[in-house]
Amino acid sequence: HTAAQDNCTCPTNKMTVCSPDGPGGRCQCRALGSGMAVDCSTLTSKCLLLKARMSAPKNARTLVRPSEHALVDNDGLYDPDCDPEGRFKARQCNQTSVCWCVNSVGVRRTDKGDLSLRCDELVRTHHILIDLRHRPTAGAFNHSDLDAELRRLFRERYRLHPKFVAAVHYEQPTIQIELRQNTSQKAAGDVDIGDAAYYFERDIKGESLFQGRGGLDLRVRGEPLQVERTLIYYLDEIPPKFSMKRLT
């Protein structure tokens, strides 16, 4: 892969350890926490990034109405189990043997249970709604300029194929970005919408995962776009299974 050959770093993931010990002395990078080799020509999976984060020192109306089945990540950070490809394992458990099922972006989609809980398949999150509220500006952004800038960002910075950015909605001060990627649409080598959304989320929070790049400087026609609130909704190909107790 294309880890930077000169000083052997990973452009797309600063939470790595790199050394020129690959075949032919090529630079090879491994994710912190898991030790798994990562492909530095593309985004690292969210599962490996979360694992690396948990291993790091602690101090380091035109708008869419989310579906009734949409999930929000209310559980916060945890140390996930990742499969050999770096994806989330369908079942996650903590140190006290409490287990739950997650979707492909690692968000809990069932009630918590014990070690007998079965999670037979990793259910894909096929629709992500990123809901942003921007800080006050002199006037509203031009919708088509905003649309073009956000599409460019996902294409160029996160390497997400343009067809997966389904829509950009704007009703000042709320911006919504819809990412859609069905199982049958995702081709080998495509960036996963869950990974792109996670990189975007970290960028917005000023915690860029890219190596040595400045933070995200989002501008629409020269006007800074500063985000003061972010909410992300996840919609799975198969609806989540929560008890009625949680829903009331």
């Epitope: 499969d83 398949e121 080998a188």
Partner: antibody, heavy 118, light 109 residues
Framework: QSLEESGGGLVQPGASLTLTCTVS????????MTWVRQAPGEGLEYIGF??????IYYANWAKGRFTISKTSSTTVTLQMTSLTVADTATYFC??????????????WGPGTLVTVSS | YDMTQTPASVSAAVGGTVTINCQAS??????LAWYQQKPGQPPKPLIY???TLASGVPSRFKGSGTGTDYTLTISDLECADAATYYC????????????FGGGTEVVVK
Amino acid sequence: QSLEESGGGLVQPGASLTLTCTVSGFDFSSNAMTWVRQAPGEGLEYIGFIGIRGNIYYANWAKGRFTISKTSSTTVTLQMTSLTVADTATYFCARGGLWTGNSYFDLWGPGTLVTVSS
Amino acid sequence: YDMTQTPASVSAAVGGTVTINCQASESISRYLAWYQQKPGQPPKPLIYRASTLASGVPSRFKGSGTGTDYTLTISDLECADAATYYCQQGYGYSTVGNAFGGGTEVVVK
């Protein structure tokens, strides 16, 4: 819609060989392509595939000696080096890849036989 | 990701039923396909995503399973069903030993 493999034949141990898969009747640019082989009387053995963005993935055992590439708008090749008698097999190309689309191979070529012998 | 297929061979009478099992070394989340192969021919897809019939395949062929364990059931056996059957995982892509199971020969008496 069809696939056809070519380039097989008799080669000596240690030699190199390139097989070609020619596609017709469908859009090559929107499909992953896979190589599979089958030794005489044995089962199917996955070699690797090339995705539509050009990403290439190999079976663990095939990394290093086998190279898959797209050489034109209608052909994908499999380069094999340092051939041994154990590489004697019928080589198939198939449409589809792993962890892509429905993740199976829905169209196969008839195969081309490679015999490695001194 | 490696696949273990059992049995290696099975025989049954015309009109009978056979069951073939496939076990993955890790969960493959229903990314499993089944193929039929006859001598001198390439494999023919029967089932994908564990239970979806490929085009033109009769409903006598049924796939099931989740997680690591999958089954192909062929009912109302016909002489034309005599062949070797293979499972194939489609979930792992860069850490794969062999995507295919070892095969099961079905003999129809």
